[in-house]
C-alpha cells in the first residue's frame, strides 16, 4: 500500500482511495473556478506517463500564493516517492511548453479519471 497518511486519514490509505480523493479535489477545483485559477499562472506541461505524479508536483509546486491548489500539491506529494522542492525538475520532466494552471488541472484530471477506470491506482 502507498503510505499517504497525513492529509486524508491517520494511517496508510489504499491507493484506490488516494487516487479517488485526488480526482475529487481536481473536480472540486474545476467546478468552483470563477476567476482565472491562480491568477492565470503558467506552469510547465507534463508528459502524462511514467513519473507523472512527481512531474505534476514539480510543475505545480512552483506556484505560490494560490490557495486553490495547495491541497492538490499536498496530495501529489503523497504519490511522489521523493521530496520535491520549488525550482527542482527531474530529468524525466521535459520542460518545453507552459500552459495555464487551469488547463494543467483539466488535463491531469482527464488522465487520472482514465487511470481510475482502468484500475491503475499506483
Amino acid at each position: 500500500l502507498t503510505c499517504l497518511g497525513g492529509f486524508a486519514s491517520p494511517g496508510p490509505v489504499p491507493p484506490s482511495t488516494a487516487l479517488r480523493e485526488l480526482i475529487e479535489e481536481l473536480v472540486n477545483i474545476t467546478q468552483n473556478q470563477k476567476a482565472p485559477l491562480c491568477n492565470g499562472s503558467m506552469v510547465w506541461s507534463i508528459n502524462l506517463t511514467a513519473g507523472m505524479y512527481c512531474a505534476a508536483l514539480e510543475s505545480l509546486i512552483n506556484v505560490s500564493g494560490c490557495s486553490a491548489i495547495e491541497k492538490t500539491q499536498r496530495m501529489l506529494s503523497g504519490f511522489c516517492p521523493h521530496k520535491v522542492s520549488a525550482g527542482q525538475f527531474s530529468s524525466l520532466h521535459v520542460r518545453d511548453t507552459k500552459i495555464e494552471v487551469a488547463q494543467f488541472v483539466k488535463d491531469l484530471l482527464l488522465h487520472l479519471k482514465k487511470l481510475f477506470r482502468e484500475g491503475q491506482f499506483n
Partner: nanobody
C-alpha cells in the same frame, strides 16, 4: 512592490523585426525565471517564451521557435524579446511576467501590430 514595465511594441510590416524590453524592479530579478506571454485580440493567453534565472535555460512556443529570442541582462534588471520575421498572427499584447505568479506580477503589456 514588484513592477514590470514593457516597452518596444508598435506597428511593423510582415517580415519585420521588433525588440521588446521589460524593466523589472521590487524583487531580486536575477533569482527568478521570467516569461513572455501574449494575448491576441479576442483570444486567450498564450505562453511565448521562458528564460531561467541565469539566462542559460530558454524555451519557446512552437509558433515562435526560430524567429524569437528571449534574453536577459541581470545587471540591468531587464528582460528582452527579439522578434524577427514577424507575421500577422503575432499581433497581440505582449506581457512580461515573473514566472508562476499570474496576473499579480505581470506588466501592463505592450501592443505589437503586424500589418502591411
Amino acid at each position: 512592490e514588484v513592477q514590470l514595465l514593457e516597452s518596444g511594441g508598435g506597428l511593423v510590416q510582415p517580415g519585420g523585426s521588433l525588440r521588446l524590453s521589460c524593466a523589472a524592479s521590487g524583487f531580486t530579478f536575477r533569482d527568478y525565471e521570467m516569461d513572455w506571454i501574449r494575448q491576441a485580440p479576442g483570444k486567450g493567453l498564450e505562453w511565448v517564451s521562458s528564460i531561467g534565472p541565469s539566462g542559460s535555460f530558454t524555451r519557446y512556443a512552437d509558433s515562435v521557435k526560430g524567429r524569437f529570442t528571449i534574453s536577459r541582462d541581470n545587471s540591468k534588471n531587464t528582460l528582452y524579446l527579439q522578434m524577427n520575421s514577424l507575421r500577422a498572427e503575432d499581433t497581440a499584447v505582449y506581457y512580461c511576467a515573473k514566472a508562476y505568479t499570474g496576473f499579480r506580477y505581470w506588466g501592463q503589456g505592450t501592443l505589437v501590430t503586424v500589418s502591411s
